[in-house]
């Protein structure tokens, strides 16, 4: 499975995107920024193996493809750059979903990084409620692209545990 | 190791132009933006304003706009303060500093050793 | 534009001291406030963020509290490298403003 080449790609052209999707200076969003506490010490403090990495990036690509996909989203970004962003995910998803399956075999599923998947999840969540609370607002928005293309960055130790050889 | 290395120090005649620079190396230059701060002689520190190297936007403090211009060079991981016509007022200690834009991180973390600009006739 | 008002703008102290310094915003910032020590010669240094995180590297005896628009920075027991100015910023909004400094001598 060769996923760190065409992923780092993958990964790059939709921070790209997510980049350009901007559409109001951030300058004007500055008293919304918030405290999402994406999980990064956990992440740090762990060495991950490939199977494991697989399925957290997984969750956290399939996390952003969701937050990206409602109607709320779409009301949001221009809409040519919104699919464009999504379909760069998607691909993500099934380079990840093709990897797990040549890695683990079709039956196997790794069980042993719930814990790390229940922690994204989480922190989709207060992404969520974050723009719940915020009515879905023009800087809601901006402080929720920036947020994610930093979780994208962080999730660099991620990508180290899928060059490893189990 | 985060660093911001500002050019050298300068002395200018009244009416002259300048641009200084700021280099930034060891993070990701455009994940940040780069604000400017003035300190005039045995005074404080005051705002000038801040680039997002990313995509150039730039915002500026009242007491600045129009009396400086801001730019940044993301090929090369360089911002920039510029003026067209010095005045005397001008001579201080110019800084630059590192800002984690709409995230939640520490606000200027990292500063430029500062570049002296000394404008007299 | 927000003002920021720092106090007192300079204090004599000895080492050991406990020494508090304040700042007042003219509106509301929540936590938005960020502290700095600068020495003569040298850039400004972060030591606290967001009102009470503490930087990366910075000693422990520095602690800030406060929220809304009175903030106040503590050194619980103040050492030699200590005597510096010390700034108080707003970085809730744009013009981003800094407090006029308190300078910390020795007595």
């Known amino acids: 499975c060769d996923l760190p080449q065409t992923h780092s790609l993958r990964n790059r052209r939709a921070l790209i995107l997510l980049a350009q999707m901007g559409r109001i200076s951030p300058f004007s969003c500055l008293k919304d920024r918030h405290e999402f506490r994406f999980p990064e010490e956990e992440f740090d403090g762990h060495q991950f193996q490939k199977t494991q990495a697989i399925s957290v990036l997984h969750e956290m690509i399939q996390q952003t493809f969701n937050l990206f996909s409602t109607e709320d989203s779409s009301a949001a970004w221009e809409q040519s750059l919104l699919e464009k962003f999504s379909t760069e995910l998607y691909q993500q998803l099934n380079d990840l979903e093709a990897c797990v399956i040549q890695e683990v075999g079709v039956e196997e599923t790794p069980l042993m990084n719930e814990d790390f998947i229940l922690a994204v999840r989480k922190y989709f969540q207060r992404i969520t409620l974050y723009l719940m609370e915020k009515k879905y607002s023009p800087c809601a928005w901006e402080v929720v692209r920036a947020e994610i293309m930093r979780s994208f960055s962080f999730s660099t130790n991620l990508k180290k545990g899928l060059r490893r050889k189990d | 190791e985060v660093q911001l290395v500002q050019s050298g120090a300068e002395v200018k005649k009244p009416g002259e132009s300048l641009k200084i620079s700021c280099k930034g190396s060891?993070?990701?230059?455009?994940?940040?933006?780069i604000g400017w701060v003035r300190q005039m002689p045995g005074k404080g520190l005051e705002w000038m304003g801040i680039?997002?190297?990313?995509?150039?936007?730039?915002a500026y403090s009242p007491s600045f706009q129009g009396q400086v211009t801001i730019s940044a060079d993301k090929s090369i991981s360089t911002a920039y303060l510029q003026w067209s016509s010095l005045k005397a007022s001008d001579t201080a200690m110019y800084y630059c500093?590192?800002?984690?834009?709409?995230?939640?991180?520490?606000?200027?973390?990292?500063w430029g050793q500062g570049t002296l600009v000394t404008v007299s006739s | 534009d927000i003002q920021m008002t720092q106090s007192p703008s300079s204090l004599s102290a000895s080492v050991g001291d406990r020494v508090t310094i304040t700042c007042r915003a003219s509106?509301?910032?929540?936590?938005?406030l960020n502290w700095y020590q600068q020495k003569p010669g040298k850039a400004p240094k972060l030591l606290i963020y967001f009102a009470s995180s503490l930087q990366s590297g910075v000693p422990s005896r520095f602690s800030g509290s406060g929220s809304g628009t009175d903030f106040t920075l503590t050194i619980s027991s103040l050492q030699p490298e200590d005597f510096a100015t010390y700034y108080c910023?707003?970085?809730?909004?744009?013009?981003?403003?800094f407090g006029q400094g308190t300078k910390v001598e020795i007595k």
């Open positions: 680039i997002d190297p990313s995509d150039s936007d730039t």
């Open positions: 060891g993070y990701s230059f455009t994940s940040y933006w």
């Open positions: 509106q509301s910032i929540d936590g938005s």
């Open positions: 500093a590192r800002h984690p834009g709409l995230n939640w991180a520490p606000d200027f973390d990292y």
């Open positions: 910023q707003q970085s809730y909004d744009f013009p981003l403003t």
